[in-house]
Amino acid sequence: EPPTACREKQYLINSQCCSLCQPGQKLVSDCTEFTETECLPCGESEFLDTWNRETHCHQHKYCDPNLGLRVQQKGTSETDTICTCEEGWHCTSEACESCVLHRSCSPGFGVKQIATGVSDTICEPCPVGFFSNVSSAFEKCHPWTSCETKDLVVQQAGTNKTDVVCGPQDRLR
């Protein structure tokens, strides 16, 4: 009696259980009473990641450099290509379909967390006693110069964007 269900890694066709093609291979012809399933390896830039009966392999993802993407890991006959962003850029989504330039922290703000390939720069305002006078994607807030340790006095107060200006102490004549 013809089967109504087949074992794992098999499929039912023409009242017969045929072996599925292994990952990395596509189906050329179904099995018959006398022949095994015929499978063929996927070609260059193609893959299939499951046991299957597909007649065409899937195309590897293209990491478009015009979108700031590059290949992080080449695809194989069984896996898709993994894209990532070029240095200085990060993915706009989990699927990493495009990239945007890392944000810079404006003067008065410092980098709390440096950007990665998947997350943007996190900035924080420079608290009292700290400053940042540049727009940067990696500079933290710097502490004001300590005039006292240099045996100098504060001539101009610091802000979140400028360092203090030190000067010589007034000498008593």
């Epitope: 293209y62 990491c63 080449k74 006959s77 070029e86």
Partner: antibody, heavy 119, light 109 residues
Framework: QSLEESGGRLVTPGGSLTLTCTVS????????MGWVRQGPGKGLEWIGT??????TDYATWAKGRFTISKTSSTTVDLKMTSPTTEDTATYFC???????????????WGQGTLVTVSS | AFELTQTPASVEAGVGGTVTIKCQAS??????LAWYQQKPGQPPKLLIS???TLTSGVPSRFKGSGSGTEFTLTISDLECADAATYYC???????????FGGGTEVVVK
């Protein structure tokens, strides 16, 4: 389509040297480029590759000593710092098969330029 | 560290004969392997990419096969013009998996 390397010369150990690859009929905005070297009587050694975006990757042994950069729409440079006698070789530039990947095969090569490191 | 071992270092065969060159990777590189031919005083010339894809203009006497870690270049019906050094190159994703084999010198008698 052609590639031509220039800048090879006798250099003293510890100095620095920049080689230039000038391309003709090749669009550097759509083709990745690589540098490969070959010591006298030795095999081929991949140095590094530059993608169309300007991103680079290097062989582990080459990191920090070699820098690849795109200097114009028709030139790619290889800068070598602190060379030793082991760096004596013919240096080839070659076109990579992909524009977005550092790990490529090379389908067009220049004739090479000889660098001799000696005191 | 990744290694690409090419054997033999040298092989000799007569005109019309066949030579087989092997290339072994220390880890799987799927099918990302290319073969080059280099003659003295000349740059390498790409023969085969992705294990078995023949470059345009290369005769079908050159045949590449393999996958994973074991690869082979077979040259049949040898001609005098085939005398050269042959290199395999892996180009999988990894700093040191973009490397060349040590080369095989083919001498045609």
């Amino acid at each position: 389509q052609s590639l031509e390397e220039s800048g090879g010369r006798l250099v003293t150990p510890g100095g620095s040297l920049t080689l230039t690859c000038t391309v003709s009929g090749i669009d550097l905005s759509t083709n990745g480029m690589g540098w490969v070297r070959q010591g006298p009587g030795k095999g081929l050694e991949w140095i590094g590759t530059i993608r169309v975006t300007g991103g680079t990757d290097y062989a582990t042994w080459a990191k920090g000593r070699f820098t690849i950069s795109k200097t114009s729409s028709t030139t790619v440079d290889l800068k070598m710092t602190s060379p030793t006698t082991e760096d004596t070789a013919t240096y080839f530039c070659a076109r990579g098969h992909a524009n977005n990947d550092a790990y490529v095969y090379f389908n067009l090569w220049g004739q090479g330029t000889l660098v001799t490191v000696s005191s | 560290a990744f290694e690409l071992t090419q054997t033999p270092a040298s092989v000799e065969a007569g005109v019309g004969g066949t030579v087989t060159i092997k290339c072994q990777a220390s880890q799987s590189i799927d099918r990302y392997l290319a073969w080059y031919q280099q003659k003295p005083g000349q740059p390498p010339k790409l023969l085969i990419s992705y294990t078995s894809t023949l470059t345009s203009g290369v005769p079908s006497r050159f045949k590449g096969s393999g996958s994973g870690t074991e690869f082979t270049l077979t040259i049949s019906d040898l001609e005098c013009a085939d005398a050269a050094t042959y290199y395999c190159q892996s180009y999988f994703t990894s700093d040191d998996a973009n490397t060349f084999g040590g080369g095989t010198e083919v001498v045609v008698k």
